[in-house]
């Protein structure tokens, strides 16, 4: 909501999760792994990389089925705590200028830092308008105090807020699982909010920094290394 059409393939780590239709976003973090939101879990997912217009085949797409879909063991569907999901692709993505991985964070998100949020979610705060082309939004990371004041009792240490307290610019339904990137690092995953772009109701995002070890451990545990004796 309140964003702009991204320059084509300018967000090369952005993926679309498809189950006959786009239902969530995600981020490519290595040639065979995608991170998304826990509440985007489905038993069958096709990962679509290199997308810009999701309604048109433009020639840069890679459609790869999910081989493994691993939701965080402490995901809570009621509170959306630990709202993170890992997807192992059935075959590695071909990395190129339009499809490439985003780095995991080396430090937690800092208030005031500019970030890029992207996705194919609803672009209206009241009503619906689902775009075909990838939308981008530049937004600042808010302080934890502002975040907690916006959602009293709802914000855990695994969440942070990004956006504008005055409303008007935000992620929305269909953006879940997608990236929040600051300084070339994946700081957030689109998670939840009360409505979209409402005053004093900024978007809430999964704090990826808290899951770097889980991500690395899960990838290691699900990578088959053949040992020759």
């Amino acid at each position: 909501v309140g964003g702009y059409i991204c320059e084509e393939n300018s967000v090369p780590y952005q993926v679309s999760l498809n189950s006959g239709y786009h239902f969530c976003g995600g981020s490519l973090i290595s040639e065979q792994w995608v991170v998304s939101a826990g509440h985007c879990y489905k038993s069958r997912i096709q990962v679509r990389l290199g997308e810009h217009n999701i309604e048109v085949l433009e020639g840069n797409e890679q459609f790869i089925n999910a081989a493994k879909i691993i939701r965080h063991p402490k995901y809570n569907s009621r509170t959306l705590d630990n709202d993170i999901l890992l997807i192992k692709l059935s075959s590695p993505a071909v990395i190129n200028s339009r499809v490439s991985a985003i780095s995991l964070p080396t430090a937690p998100p800092a208030a005031g830092t500019e970030s890029l949020i992207s996705g194919w979610g609803n672009t209206l705060s009241s009503g619906a308008d689902y775009p075909d082309e990838l939308q981008c939004l530049d937004a600042p990371v808010l302080s934890q105090a502002e975040c907690e004041a916006s959602y009293p009792g709802k914000i855990t240490n695994n969440m942070f807020c990004v956006g504008f307290l005055e409303g008007g610019k935000d992620s929305c339904q269909g953006d879940a699982g997608g990236p929040v990137v600051s300084n070339g690092e994946l700081q957030g995953i689109v998670s939840w909010g009360y409505g979209c772009a409402q005053k004093n109701r900024p978007g809430v995002y999964t704090k990826v920094y808290n899951y770097v070890d889980w991500i690395k451990d899960t990838i290691a545990a699900n990578s088959h290394h053949h040992h020759h004796h």
């Epitope: 239709y21 939101a37 619906a128 689902y130 953006d175 879940a176 699982g177 998670s191 939840w192 009360y194």
Partner: antibody, heavy 127, light 108 residues
């Protein structure tokens, strides 16, 4: 069970106003958007507008802007649709309809549709 | 405004036969499409949402398909209770929410 119960039939004179109520039961009223749809005799379905019962925010079809007002009373889980300056071509059955899938906080896409409908309220405008 | 066009306006089918109803959108609505059944004197009833997902309690003989601008509702073997008017509706871009004009399925 989940249901929407509407107020009874009305007969109004041209220029008058009508207010139709829609009482929800069996679910959390504030968690689901409510829409209003009308159907003139022998005709198809026409969307009039919607209300977010939680915030009170509304969306009206352009055709009805300035004539329709949608409100709600959360204490009695009831939505209202008031149409003013009635004309004979407003004679129709008026339905309230709930959008399925709670207005969840999570930002995954979920398909929308009117999963529960009221029984309809016949409004006749005649001099 | 997205215009929804249904065809045919009337479909005459014998019980036990297959019925295929069409709905076309003036621009892409993705998979944001629903189908409703309405019988005389009754409120509409949701059959299909998300273009292809059957609503709770809807028999398997009803199926929806399509995406973008072309959609189909198929009733595999018509039962006597299936003779009614069917409407499609888009939820992709609103306001306004728009319905098709309806297809009446009548006994041949």
């Amino acid at each position: 069970q989940v249901q929407l119960v509407q107020s009874g039939a009305e007969v109004k004179k041209p220029g008058a106003s009508v207010k139709v109520s829609c009482k929800a039961s069996g679910y959390t009223f504030t968690g689901y958007y409510m829409h209003w749809v009308r159907q003139a005799p022998g005709q198809g379905l026409e969307w009039m507008g919607s209300i977010n019962p939680s915030s009170g925010g509304t969306n009206y079809a352009q055709k009805f802007q300035g004539r329709v007002t949608m409100t709600r009373d959360t204490s009695i889980s009831t939505a209202y649709m008031e149409l003013s300056r009635l004309r004979s071509d407003d004679t129709a059955v008026y339905y309230c309809a709930r959008v399925g899938g709670a207005a969840a906080a999570g930002k995954a896409y979920t398909a929308s549709a009117f999963d529960i409908w009221g029984q309809g309220t016949m409004v006749t405008v005649s001099s | 405004e997205i215009v929804m066009t249904q065809s045919p306006a009337t479909l005459s089918v014998s019980p036990g036969e297959r019925a295929t109803l069409s709905c076309r959108a003036s621009q892409s609505v993705g998979s944001n499409l629903a189908w409703y059944q309405q019988k005389p004197g009754q409120a509409p009833r949701l059959l299909i949402y998300g273009a292809s997902t059957r609503a709770t309690g809807i028999p398997a003989r009803f199926s929806g398909s399509g995406s973008g601008t072309e959609f189909t509702l198929t009733i595999s073997s018509l039962q006597s209770e299936d003779f009614a008017v069917y409407y499609c509706q888009q939820f992709h871009n609103w306001p306004p929410l728009t319905f098709g004009g309806g297809t009446k399925v009548e006994i041949k």
